[in-house]
């Protein structure tokens, strides 16, 4: 929802968290603001305190329940409001009717581990975290490998077009240190975006055997 120079963007992690960012040019840094969530068909509502993340933007997480509980469904609509205190009163600064499963951003994949490493290849696995059972197998992943002397931005993206929680990296250099990251995205949702990148997994390929042609 955009009002003039105000921007209010929220994402649902598919289970029990809605993360919101509100930016407003010229807003007072010390103003107390909150996000209020009112589902259309639920008995609960939730509030979180907006905290500054930059000069003109604030963020907060609406914790709807325990991390793996399915707190919203595909047919829920949540009214989200930014409310700021003005003296003794609260003023509404932004509002949106939020369809959770059209605005998804999952948690970063976790539990990255090296399953098997050789001189030229490495098999890596991971797990998805707090992802709804709704998605079945309809998720996609992007992965990238950091090679020596390069930046993450230079790393080519590898796309896995199905729910495949492992990858076999090929054509690696022996006895070389690498890092690996992966992110996930459901197919569902018009405004759905990629999860954050996972924590990097560092690994080293095995040295080439002496006297052998590699």
């Amino acid at each position: 929802a955009v009002n003039g120079t105000s921007r209010f963007t929220c994402f649902y992690n598919s289970r029990a968290n809605i993360s919101c960012v509100w930016s407003q040019d010229g807003a007072l840094q010390d103003t107390s603001c909150q996000v209020h969530a009112w589902p259309d068909r639920r008995r609960w509502n939730q509030t979180c305190e907006l905290l500054p993340v930059s000069q003109a933007s604030w963020a907060c997480n609406l914790i709807l329940g325990t991390p793996d509980s399915q707190k919203l469904t595909a047919v829920d609509i949540v009214t989200l409001r930014v409310m700021c205190r003005e003296g003794v009163r609260w003023r509404m600064m932004a509002i949106q009717d939020f369809k959770p499963f059209e605005n998804l951003r999952l948690m970063a994949p976790i539990s990255l581990q090296v399953v098997h490493v050789e001189t030229h290849r490495c098999n890596i696995s991971w797990k998805i975290s707090q992802a709804s059972h709704y998605f079945e197998r309809h998720l996609e992943f992007e992965a990238r490998t950091l090679s020596p002397g390069h930046t993450w931005e230079e790393a080519p993206l590898m796309t896995l077009k199905q729910k495949q929680e492992w990858i076999c990296l090929e054509t690696l250099t022996p006895d070389t240190q690498y890092e690996f990251q992966v992110r996930v995205k459901p197919l569902q949702g018009e405004f759905t975006t990629w999860s954050p990148w996972s924590q990097p997994l560092a690994f080293r390929t095995k040295p080439a055997a002496l006297g052998k042609d590699t």
């Epitope: 399915q70 059972h133 998605f135 197919l187 569902q188």
Partner: antibody, heavy 117, light 107 residues
């Protein structure tokens, strides 16, 4: 292999109630959604509702919610659809299906219900 | 309730030729459109999700596309087993609704 096996054909009188079962195998029933869809002659496919076995919630289409009840028995991996106050236009094939909320990935073989006096 | 309109109601095509089936939504549904195939006496089978994503195990000759509220299912080279009824279904607004179907028959 994912399988949904439905109970057999039913003949009912107007005003009666029918209860159809859908026994599933090949996937985790406790973490699934089971949908029910009606296919009446000349009316095409109509989505009736679903049960979310993990969240323990049901969702019904407005056109059916007064007369339909969807339940599940997680001890036997079986879902049920009960349709009450039957009328002639309820004569149809009824399907159970597994899917997320948005589309139906696997279907049962269908159960024919005939409503006739 | 969103109305899904499929056209034509019946399409006659020769084996080996291309078939193009259309589905139009009565309002904007983003890419929340899914295609099914149904053969006589059988349950529907999911072919394509979100307008253009093929389901694993579905032959590559089936493809989907979208232009605004109009969605197209294309079968590039018809095989004998492709003659069936095809349904579209929207999942943008509750309740989810199906088109009335297009019957694809042998010419």
């Amino acid at each position: 292999e994912v399988q949904l096996v439905q109970s057999g054909a039913e003949v009912k009188k107007p005003g009666a109630t029918v209860k159809i079962s859908c026994k599933v195998s090949g996937f985790n029933f406790k973490e699934s959604l089971i949908h029910w869809v009606q296919q009446a002659p000349g009316k095409g496919l109509e989505w009736m509702g679903w049960i979310d076995n993990e969240a323990g919630e049901t969702e019904y289409a407005p056109g059916f919610q007064d007369r339909v009840t969807i339940t599940a028995d997680t001890s036997t991996d079986t879902a049920y659809m009960e349709l009450s106050s039957l009328r002639s236009e309820d004569t149809a094939v009824y399907y159970c299906a597994r899917g997320g909320p948005w589309f139906l990935s696997y279907w049962g073989q269908g159960t024919t219900v005939t409503v006739s006096s | 309730e969103i109305v899904m309109t499929q056209s034509p109601a019946t399409l006659s095509v020769s084996p080996g030729e291309r078939a193009t089936l259309s589905c139009r939504a009565s309002q904007i549904i983003s890419n929340n459109l899914h295609w099914y195939q149904q053969k006589p006496g059988q349950a529907p089978r999911l072919l394509i999700i979100y307008g253009l994503q093929s389901i694993s195990g579905i032959p590559a000759r089936f493809s989907g596309s979208r232009s605004g509220t109009e969605f197209t299912l294309t079968i590039s080279s018809l095989q004998s087993e492709d003659f069936a009824v095809y349904f579209c279904q929207q999942s943008n607004n509750f309740p989810y609704t199906f088109g009335q179907g297009t019957k694809l028959e042998i010419k």
